[in-house]
Interface confidence: low
């Protein structure tokens, strides 16, 4: 079972959306909250939350030190949420530290937020 969180947390994917002309009438993209910086310990689990709202619902990508984040089975994963996206890194190692950026786009606009894991 995944650990449940007290912050925005466990609601998930928003991938293949049907974007109708109706949806496009009132398009917007908002960063609901800047990403937090996180300090944690080796071996622990870290979570970064990208909180965005948009119409049409945004596509969200994650970058670490400007390179796309690659998921690792059972260790590093990200899930889209109805609030945006959540990046989870388990069993932290020193190599996991760095600048993490989420980039959200609704096809018209782009917003991003950066947090530091150290």
């Amino acid at each position: 079972q995944e650990t449940e969180l007290s912050v925005s947390a466990e609601l998930v994917p928003t991938s293949s959306w049907n974007i109708s002309s109706e949806l496009n009438k009132d398009s917007y993209l908002t960063l609901d909250e800047p990403m937090n910086n996180i300090t944690t310990s080796l071996g622990q689990t870290a979570e970064l939350h990208c909180k965005v709202s948009g119409n049409p619902p945004p596509t969200i990508r994650w970058f670490k030190n400007d390179a796309p984040v690659v998921q690792e089975p059972r260790r590093l994963s990200f899930r889209s949420t109805i609030y945006g996206s959540r990046l989870r890194i388990r069993n932290l190692d020193t190599t996991d530290t760095g600048y993490f950026q989420c980039v959200a786009t609704n096809g018209k606009e782009v917003v991003s937020s950066t947090g530091v894991l150290f």
Partner: antibody, heavy 114, light 107 residues
């Protein structure tokens, strides 16, 4: 422990407005979304929308567009849902629920009757 | 809007029975599904999230399966306190939509 405590039952006339409050304790209101869900007597559940108390952003079910307002007062850790132009079919129990629907308020019965 | 349907709408069962409730979405919702239990006059209680993850404090006799458009809530051995109405909720798309509910009562 996490608690959501809602305001008491209301009786309103058609065309009036009602404002329901939801006071949060045991966690940080501003970093968790707050959903509002309603349930008419003997019926199922209906999602109305959410507010992000951190900045006041809202997302509504289009069914309620123009009639629902969601606000918050972070100084007293309270979220509010106001529904205007009430009709008899708005008679329901109104619930607030935290981000992931893991904690719910006890519900507020709103009766709309002439 | 995504339509959620549940079957059966009501069922009678006995203590110890294995109970299966299904929820169908009108389009693919991945695993964006929550199951709730609600007893008369009470607040809904979250049982399962991510379609298959058991919420904290929920007995292991409850389990969820499925993805895409077909989902199942299973109670492996029905207990007296399980007689209630069960709802599914999709959170793939706005507006979030609930199923109409399945009432489980005593046979």
């Amino acid at each position: 422990q996490v608690q959501l405590v809602q305001s008491g039952a209301e009786v309103k006339k058609p065309g009036a407005s009602v404002k329901v409050s939801c006071k949060a304790s045991g966690y940080t209101l501003t970093t968790n979304y707050m959903h509002w869900v309603r349930q008419a007597p003997g019926q199922g559940l209906e999602w109305m929308g959410w507010i992000y108390p951190g900045n006041g952003n809202t997302k509504f079910n289009h069914k309620f567009d123009g009639r629902v307002t969601m606000t918050r007062d972070t100084s007293i850790s309270t979220a509010y849902m106001e529904l205007s132009r009430l009709r008899s079919d708005d008679t329901a129990v109104y619930y607030c629920a935290r981000s992931d629907f893991d904690y719910w308020g006890q519900g507020t019965l709103v009766t709309v009757s002439s | 809007d995504i339509q959620m349907t549940q079957s059966p709408s009501a069922m009678s069962a006995s203590v110890g029975d294995r109970v299966t409730i299904t929820c169908q979405a009108s389009q693919d919702i991945g695993n964006n599904l929550i199951w709730f239990q609600q007893k008369p006059g009470k607040v809904p209680k979250r049982l399962i999230y991510f379609a298959t993850s058991l919420a904290n404090g929920v007995p292991s006799r409850f389990s969820g399966s499925g993805s895409g458009t077909e989902f199942t809530l299973t109670i492996s051995s029905l207990q007296p306190e399980d007689f209630a109405t069960y709802y599914c909720l999709q959170y793939r798309e706005y507006p979030l939509t609930f199923g109409p509910g399945t009432k489980v009562d005593i046979k």
